[in-house]
């Protein structure tokens, strides 16, 4: 069978080889498509409801005024010339529709290096067959599931037209110290060969590099955190970041009900004040960051305090946000 590719909505003429150029003709067209069950026979003297789909022209050719998805299938003509010689024509018709230019919607203007970011969603509407969407970074194809690249795809079919809408959401994790203005684009590749890809306009989000956080320092006075009963302990939370973050205090892992302050003074120490203290610095851009923990203890007169203080672990690092 001869392969024919026809655009949806366009007319199509299939020649009946060997047919006399004008009536009287002995010919018959048979079609097996999405509109037929088994074979439908159309003859030159036909004419009727099927004319809206396909009709035999005076020269014996079959005319389809506007090809549709349901016209995909096999078309056969059997003709006999004036001398009684029979000729058969056999066509396999496939249809296509090129969508409008794809677009990137919900695109990000800024990405953060080192963490997953949604770049945008590529949308293509009105294709047949469905075709595929692919993403490009600086002109080179992006491969999903490689180097922090992930793609979520969705295909929908219009209930009336049968045409496809494709959606592809791109997530990337930009490398630290990489290109500050990467160029992303998306392209639609048709499901049928010999049709060029359609590419979106590019987008160029900025990549923001988060400044690595310097550690929150907790300084205890007296050094080591051991103090005689009735003495005073001063805890100072030092944060290099600008602007100064809010400082809250924790004792034994529980927030203390105090107003934010970089200094915590414990006057007239008693047994109830013993425990492990830390401070939490809350940055508007980074979220909370906890210091190491220090242990405050009471020493009875005549006891030697610990030389370096009984210092706890390094804290929890950056707290996860609930």
């Amino acid at each position: 069978a001869q392969n024919i590719t026809a655009r949806i909505g366009e007319p199509l003429v299939l020649k009946c080889k060997g047919a006399p150029k004008k009536p009287p003709q002995r010919l018959e067209w048979k079609l097996n498509t999405g509109r037929t069950e088994a074979w439908k026979v159309l003859s030159p003297q036909g004419g009727g409801p099927w004319d809206s789909v396909a009709r035999v022209l005076p020269n014996g050719s079959l005319f389809l005024p506007a090809v549709g998805i349901q016209d995909e299938g096999i078309f056969r003509c059997q003709a006999m010339n004036r001398n009684g010689k029979e000729t058969k024509s056999n066509y396999r018709v496939r249809v296509y529709q090129i969508p409008g230019k794809p677009e990137i919607v919900d695109s990000a203007s800024e990405l953060t290096a080192g963490v997953p970011n949604k770049v945008g969603t590529c949308v293509s509407e009105g294709s047949y067959p469905a075709g595929t969407l692919s993403w490009h970074l600086d002109g080179k194809p992006l491969v999903p599931n490689e180097k922090g690249v992930s793609v979520k795809e969705q295909t929908r079919r219009h209930p009336e037209t049968g045409l496809f809408t494709l959606q592809s959401e791109l997530m990337v994790t930009p490398a630290r110290g990489g290109d500050p203005r990467p160029t992303f684009s998306c392209s639609f590749s048709p499901g049928l060969p010999r049709h060029r890809a359609l590419r979106t306009a590019p987008i160029q989000p900025r990549v923001w590099e988060p400044v690595p956080l310097e550690e929150v320092q907790l300084v205890v006075e007296p050094e080591g955190g051991a103090v005689a009963p009735g003495g005073t302990v001063t805890l100072t939370c030092e944060v290099p970041a600008q602007p100064s973050p809010q400082i809250h205090w924790m004792k034994d892992g529980v927030p203390l009900p105090l107003p934010p302050s970089p200094v915590l003074i414990l006057p007239e120490i008693g047994p109830q004040d013993q425990g492990t203290y830390s401070c939490v610095a809350t940055h508007s851009s980074h979220g909370p960051q906890e210091s190491r923990a220090v242990s405050i203890s009471i020493i009875e007169p005549g006891e030697e305090g610990p030389t370096a203080g009984s210092v706890g672990g390094s804290g929890l690092g950056t707290l996860a946000l609930a």
């Epitope: 069950e37 439908k40 004419g47 009727g48 409801p49 004319d51 809206s52 789909v53 549709g68």
Partner: antibody, heavy 119, light 107 residues
Framework: EVQLVESGGGLVQPGGSLRLSCAAS????????MTWVRQAPGKGLEWVAS????????YYPDSVKDRFTISRDNAKNSLYLQMNSLRAEDTAVYYC????????????WGQGTLVTVSS | DIQMTQSPSSLSASVGDRVTITCRAS??????VNWFQQKPGKAPRRLIY???NLADGVPSRFSGSRSGTDFTLTISSLQPEDFATYYC?????????FGGGTKVEIK
């Protein structure tokens, strides 16, 4: 909303003529075939004529061929039925309907207009 | 020309009954049969298109089926508003041919 409104019916003598009109709205008129169907009082439905979307091809049953002519004006979203040499048996309610082909078969109908052929 | 033989020409039924109406085509018409409902003084309304497809806005108690050249309209549970006349239509070939109609009356 698809709407089809017939007009032009009435009383006519045998041998006389009448022209029915159908005003279409709510859809792209020139994308569709159009059809006239009639129903004699107390009887069933009978196909009268169809026309393709361009107006180039028309179709009739033997009962009205050479007497009735279906036509359309796509610019005016209008369908017509010119009825000549009318007979008593043409008395019926005449309905205009969208479609009549393989793609869209009589999906929407008008409310009909009564044609009475009597002396 | 194709003939569409519709049966029965009338039937009496009660609300809640299952009703079946049949049309037989005199030759192969593929899937190209519609069913219509008509109430007195009103235009026909398409119920089923291409033998088995329910038209928009038509209750799911209506269904269509096909076996060769036999086409069936079924109302699974008759409702008061379903008392009307039903027609089949063949649109595979000209002349388009309607069945003779089936009048569904209250028992």
């Amino acid at each position: 909303e698809v709407q089809l409104v017939e007009s032009g019916g009435g009383l006519v003598q045998p041998g006389g003529s009448l022209r029915l009109s159908c005003a279409a709205s709510g859809f792209t008129f020139n994308n569709y075939w159009m059809t006239w169907v009639r129903q004699a009082p107390g009887k069933g439905l009978e196909w009268v004529a169809s026309i393709d979307n361009s107006g180039d091809n028309t179709y009739y049953p033997d009962s009205v061929k050479d007497r009735f002519t279906i036509s359309r004006d796509n610019a005016k979203n209008s369908l017509y039925l010119q009825m000549n040499s009318l007979r008593a048996e043409d008395t019926a309610v005449y309905y205009c309907a969208r479609g009549g082909d393989i793609l869209d078969s009589l999906h929407f109908w008008g409310q009909g207009t009564l044609v009475t052929v009597s002396s | 020309d194709i003939q569409m033989t519709q049966s029965p020409s009338s039937l009496s039924a009660s609300v809640g009954d299952r009703v079946t109406i049949t049309c037989r085509a005199s030759q192969d018409v593929g899937i190209y049969v519609n069913w219509f409902q008509q109430k007195p003084g009103k235009a026909p309304r398409r119920l089923i298109y291409r033998a088995t497809n329910l038209a928009d806005g038509v209750p799911s108690r209506f269904s269509g089926s096909r076996s060769g050249t036999d086409f069936t309209l079924t109302i699974s549970s008759l409702q008061p508003e379903d008392f009307a006349t039903y027609y089949c239509l063949e649109f595979d070939e000209h002349p388009l041919t309607f069945g003779g109609g089936t009048k569904v009356e209250i028992k």
